[in-house]
């Protein structure tokens, strides 16, 4: 079995401001065990944008449905995109862990610019 | 050796759709992603769109949206490109091209061509 | 959509000298989170798909002479063969990875003068 490979396919999405910019991830395996999150920005002070676990996230939902047996695409769509919305986003694999997951491995990024609302 | 192998030339009636084949022979064909290009006679190489089959939708080109379809089936490790509505300056070699997945850098180029597929539309 | 300008149309170069083609986009394929630029070279020769040569901007594909080298960031970039040799003979095209459309560059022909 190959390695799990974390895709994000775009380097950049430009959404005008208003719409609903999607984010496309997927996985390559099932394995390990563990949640997808979905992240702006790197390092220490990295902003949870969604918790495929917990959490309530009212702008982001998922493009299909997680619950699903063998579901491998883990693609996002936030609602109604802001100015300050614009950055880098990350999708990452975590492992199942006790008592914290711990992260697996983190996809390539991709840059979200924000374009003025069309007058 | 991982190859991709396209079907054979076609001859079409303008107005008429063509359907174009490429299997992937090896490879993680699910993380690839599939471009088709094509290349009308004497002129430049040109991009219509791709799909990643894990994803399962594909991402087209402005010019040629809402008239071509690309699809893949992972069971055959196939991708397809249909094109509808089809006129004489749609005559060319169309080719499918692989662009493989690295970690944390992404798709880098297209590095695995077809031999491409010969579409001549004329009445 | 990402418009990539070649430069120029055809060139004719004596063997063994150097060749330099030119491809500028209509704006940044740098991904600043890894310092990546989404741009690639292929080589395509009469009757035969592209192959190739250059991703990254300036890696260099497996099994490419080391004569072929590239180069640039942000916006321009430079494919330059550093000794052309009868066999380099062809169409050079660039391409950009960075958003969708990847679009390609208009081609540059080399020949030898």
């Known amino acids: 079995e190959d390695e799990l490979q974390v895709i994000q396919p775009e380097k950049s999405v430009s959404v005008a401001a208003g719409e609903s910019a999607t984010l496309r991830c997927a996985m390559t395996s099932l394995i390990p065990v563990g949640p997808i999150m979905w992240f702006r920005g790197a390092g220490a002070g990295r902003e949870l944008i969604y918790n495929q676990k917990e959490g309530h996230f009212p702008r982001v939902t998922t493009v299909s449905e997680l619950t699903k047996r063998n579901n491998l695409d883990f693609s996002i769509s936030i609602s109604n995109i802001t100015p300050a919305d614009a950055g880098t986003y990350y999708c990452v694999k975590f492992r199942k862990g006790s008592p914290d997951d711990v992260e697996f491995k983190s996809g390539a990024g991709t840059e979200l610019s924000v374009r003025a609302k069309p007058s | 050796q991982v190859q991709l192998v396209q079907s054979g030339a076609e001859v079409k009636k303008p107005g008429s759709s063509v359907k174009v084949s490429c299997k992937a022979s090896g490879g993680t064909f699910s993380s690839y992603a599939i471009s088709w290009v094509r290349q009308a006679p004497g002129q430049g190489l040109e991009w219509m769109g791709s799909?990643?089959?894990?994803?399962?939708?594909?991402n087209y080109a402005q010019k040629f949206q809402g008239r071509v379809t690309i699809t893949a089936d992972e069971s055959t490790s196939t991708a397809y490109m249909e094109l509808s509505s089809l006129r004489s300056e749609d005559t060319a070699v169309y080719y499918c091209?692989?662009?493989?997945?690295?970690?944390?850098?992404?798709?880098?180029?297209?590095?695995?061509w077809g031999r491409g597929t010969l579409v001549t539309v004329s009445s | 959509d990402i418009v990539m300008t070649q430069s120029p149309d055809s060139l004719a170069v004596s063997l063994g000298e150097r060749a330099t083609i030119n491809c500028k986009s209509s704006q940044s394929v740098l991904f600043s989170s890894n310092n990546k630029n989404y741009l690639a070279w292929y080589q395509q020769k009469p009757g035969q798909p592209p192959k190739l040569l250059i991703y990254?901007?300036?890696t260099r594909e497996s099994g490419v002479p080391d004569r072929f080298s590239g180069s640039g960031s942000g916006t321009d970039f430079t494919l330059t063969i550093s000794s052309l040799q009868a066999e380099d003979v062809a169409v050079y095209y660039c391409?950009?990875?960075?958003?969708?459309?990847?679009?390609f560059g208009g081609g540059t022909k080399v020949e030898i003068k």
């Open positions: 799909i990643i089959p894990i994803f399962g939708t594909a």
């Open positions: 990254w901007a300036s």
């Open positions: 091209a692989r662009a493989n997945y690295y970690d944390s850098s992404g798709y880098s180029g297209l590095d695995l």
């Open positions: 391409q950009q990875l960075f958003s969708t459309p990847f679009t």
